[in-house]
């Protein structure tokens, strides 16, 4: 025997109390799949969240963050404060990168400057709080057509998010 609820499309629910008829989801709710016995409550983008996509009868609302904040977590479950380049977010707010570290983004953590001497290269440009060191070529690398600079270390995502 086929479940009569399987005929209820997305945007409806199968009413337990009314002989399993398909009824539309009420306002501020949705069902993204067919055959559901309940409608889910629409997400509300309040406070530091703003609406990127309105809720419909078949799909949840999607939020992003107001200016000065960026999304964290699956589906932008949290908004984290932006900092300036050359800073990182700590529990006490945005703090400048310590000497020897940099952050070239508005989010994430300060990362150590590239150590040119480990690669046997001279420093071509000193690092700052907002920019990595630029390493020059190895003396032996100075041949025609060779690149004269080493690209900075690739940016990596932070491994933590401040509370």
């Amino acid at each position: 025997l086929q479940d009569p609820c399987s005929n209820c499309p997305a945007g409806t629910f199968c009413d337990n109390n009314r002989n399993q008829i398909c009824s539309p989801c009420p306002p501020n709710s949705f069902s993204s799949a067919g055959g559901q016995r309940t409608c889910d409550i629409c997400r509300q983008c309040k406070g530091v969240f703003r609406t990127r996509k309105e809720c419909s009868s078949t799909s949840n609302a999607e939020c992003d963050c107001t200016p000065g904040f960026h999304c964290l977590g699956a589906g932008c479950s949290m908004c984290e404060q932006d900092c300036k380049q050359g800073q990182e977010l700590t529990k006490k707010g945005c703090k400048d990168c310590c000497f020897g570290t940099f952050n070239d983004q508005k989010r994430g953590i300060c990362r150590p400057w590239t150590n040119c001497s480990l690669a046997g290269k001279p420093v071509l440009m000193n690092g700052t709080k907002a920019r990595d060191v630029v390493c020059g070529p190895r003396p032996a690398d100075l041949s025609p057509g060779a690149s004269s600079v080493t690209p900075p270390a690739p940016a990596r995502e932070p491994g933590h998010s401040p509370q």
Partner: antibody, heavy 122, light 112 residues
Framework: QSVEESGGRLVTPGTPLTLTCTVS????????MTWVRQAPGKGLEYIGI??????TYYASWAKGRFTISKTSSTTLELKITSPTTEDTAIYFC??????????????????WGPGTLVTVSS | AAVLTQTPSPVSAAVGGTVTISCQAS????????LSWFQKKPGQPPKLLIY???SLASGVPSRFKGSGSGTQFTLTISDLESDDAATYYC????????????FGGGTEVVVK
């Protein structure tokens, strides 16, 4: 159709605790389920709900402190992530009957389980 | 978040009398009607009395009557019996994915 909670016990602050709500006579996929608590000498306090499809919604004060999950079609769990002494209470699980046919949680909480006592003390 | 204020507490009446408990919401509940009333006795789980503001739950005597809409709701218990001594709570449903439900603070009914 019935609901029963279990897992309440004495725990020390910071020790995670998981409560279980076992239902019979219906499937969790057919209804919203809610968790409510009552601290000694206090009133009823809404913690959160789970929809038939498994989506969870929490009271603002409970976000991050509690996690509701479904482990089977008849078993619901409430995890108290890091209990404090303020979490000492009787914890109740209840079905939302949605007798008016709205299609989502309406507050028609029935039936209820007898409750399970959680005591947080050092 | 919305707040539900119940008054008065405690309220007392004689057997056979009538008590009226009010529940005032700071914001309108969903559909102006999604408000429930529960009876709570010590050592027992809450019992659903009224749902959707005025609908009587199954097995509940008609002595219990719910009324109201929007932000103002009332539970009236007539022909009071000694077994009605309990604390009564209202709960409202709100259009929010947080604080979807809010309970009132409760009203104790004393039967003399």
């Amino acid at each position: 159709q019935s609901v029963e909670e279990s897992g309440g016990r004495l725990v020390t602050p910071g020790t995670p605790l998981t409560l279980t709500c076992t239902v019979s006579g219906f499937s969790l996929s057919d209804y919203y389920m809610t968790w409510v608590r009552q601290a000694p000498g206090k009133g009823l306090e809404y913690i959160g709900i789970m929809s038939g499809s498994g989506s969870t919604y929490y009271a603002s004060w409970a976000k991050g402190r509690f996690t509701i999950s479904k482990t089977s079609s008849t078993t619901l769990e409430l995890k108290i992530t890091s209990p404090t002494t303020e979490d000492t209470a009787i914890y109740f699980c209840a079905r939302d009957g949605d007798y008016a046919g709205w299609g989502y949680a309406t507050g028609a909480f029935d039936p209820w389980g007898p409750g399970t006592l959680v005591t947080v003390s050092s | 978040a919305a707040v539900l204020t119940q008054t008065p507490s405690p309220v007392s009446a004689a057997v056979g009398g009538t008590v009226t408990i009010s529940c005032q919401a700071s914001q309108s509940v969903v559909g102006n009607s999604l408000l429930s009333w529960f009876q709570k006795k010590p050592g027992q789980p809450p019992k659903l009395l009224i749902y959707s503001a005025s609908s009587l739950a199954s097995g509940v005597p008609s002595r219990f009557k719910g009324s109201g809409s929007g932000t103002q709701f009332t539970l009236t218990i007539s022909d009071l019996e000694s077994d009605d001594a309990a604390t009564y709570y209202c709960t409202g449903r709100y259009n929010s994915d947080t604080d979807t439900f809010v309970f009132g603070g409760g009203t104790e009914v004393v039967v003399k």
